[in-house]
Amino acid sequence: APTSSSTSSSTAEAQQQQQQQQQQQQHLEQLLMDLQELLSRMENYRNLKLPRMLTFKFYLPKQATELKDLQCLEDELGPLRHVLDLTQSKSFQLEDAENFISNIRVTVVKLKGSDNTFECQFDDESATVVDFLRRWIAFCQSIISTSPQ
């Protein structure tokens, strides 16, 4: 029969695991919100106004199903910030693009871990910034929907 000490330690482990899952869920929801905010601003901006925004190429992973695949998103945050910096104007304003991208990067690292040994396998096909954001939004939604509540 299990002792009281082993029962309490397994309960603590379960609670810790549940807490980690809740945190992971919160981080995913935060990342999803940030990506949706960016996409919303770009779409409200009437994509057509800035051809230079849509001429930029972004790279997507061959397949993204796990949190470690967020490395592929982290790898593209530099170019994403570059596009945001370039597209600042009267009708498309992000108060602090650097801070916005920095927050996304922090959330991504919390989710995938700080180990950068995983090398992203990018797809041969590239995407516009709009399609890039849509793809990562779908990724977050998929992980959230399959996570234990």
Epitope: L48, K49, R52, L54, T55, F56, K57, L86, S126, T128
Partner: antibody, heavy 117, light 109 residues
């Protein structure tokens, strides 16, 4: 049908001014950039600049900055390219083209400008 | 100023495959577009965003991209494909558009 119709051929003398036009139809003219492209006789295409008719935001190639002016009148769905003082080297075919998210997808038929004394 | 480099001419026999390259430093981050221009006519878009084909353009036209080079491929070239082909893209800031110098495709025979 989506199309751009340009004004007719022009023959001018050096030093004269000129304004050529490009009228859009079959789409919302306001919300697509219009680009201008030069093609000198027997030569390739050169991007001159673009204008966004909704607010007349303009971008010029460094090679054409200060040499030409683009403008637009969204009320009549027309973009313009103008010169204050023409030179013989301005002799060329000038195309307007609509820039959408998928490049210069619709082109005008071109306006031939000849500058000769 | 930013430049795109194309070979001045390419010659192929009917039915063969023609490949026209275009190179530029910004191409890893900027999409490329290809236009066909026949004598006395306005250019026509044949490939957009590196690899996409507009409706109405024959399937024998395709595009690919690798690093600083993009390629227009015409498989099973036909006599009617004889024309000048131009690549177009933007500088690294996306501000200025630019055309390559153009490639004259000659269909032999």
């Amino acid at each position: 049908e989506v199309q751009l119709v340009q004004s007719g051929a022009e023959v001018k003398k050096p030093g004269e001014s000129l304004k050529i036009s490009c009228k859009g139809s079959g789409y919302n003219f306001d919300t697509y950039w219009i680009g201008w492209v030069r093609q000198m006789p027997g030569r390739g295409l050169e991007w001159m600049g673009t204008i966004y008719p909704a607010d007349s935001d303009t971008r010029y190639s460094p090679s054409f900055q200060g040499q030409v002016t683009t403008s637009a009148d969204k009320s009549i769905s027309t973009a313009y390219l103008q010169w204050g003082s023409l030179r013989a080297s301005d002799t060329a075919m000038y195309y307007c083209a609509r820039f959408s998210s998928s490049a210069y997808d619709i082109w005008g038929q071109g306006t031939m400008v000849t500058v000769s004394s | 100023s930013y430049e795109l480099t194309q070979p001045p001419s390419v010659s192929v026999s009917p039915g063969q495959t023609a490949r026209i390259t275009c190179s530029g430093d910004a191409l890893p981050r900027q999409f490329a577009y290809w236009y066909q221009q026949k004598p006395g006519q306005a250019p026509v878009l044949v490939i957009y965003k590196d690899t996409e084909r507009p409706s109405g353009i024959p399937e024998r036209f395709s595009g690919s991209s690798s690093g600083t080079t993009v390629t227009l491929t015409i498989s099973g070239v036909q006599a009617e494909d004889e024309a000048d082909y131009y690549c177009q893209s933007a500088d690294s800031s996306g501000t200025y558009h630019v055309f390559g110098g153009g490639t004259q495709l000659t269909v032999l025979g």
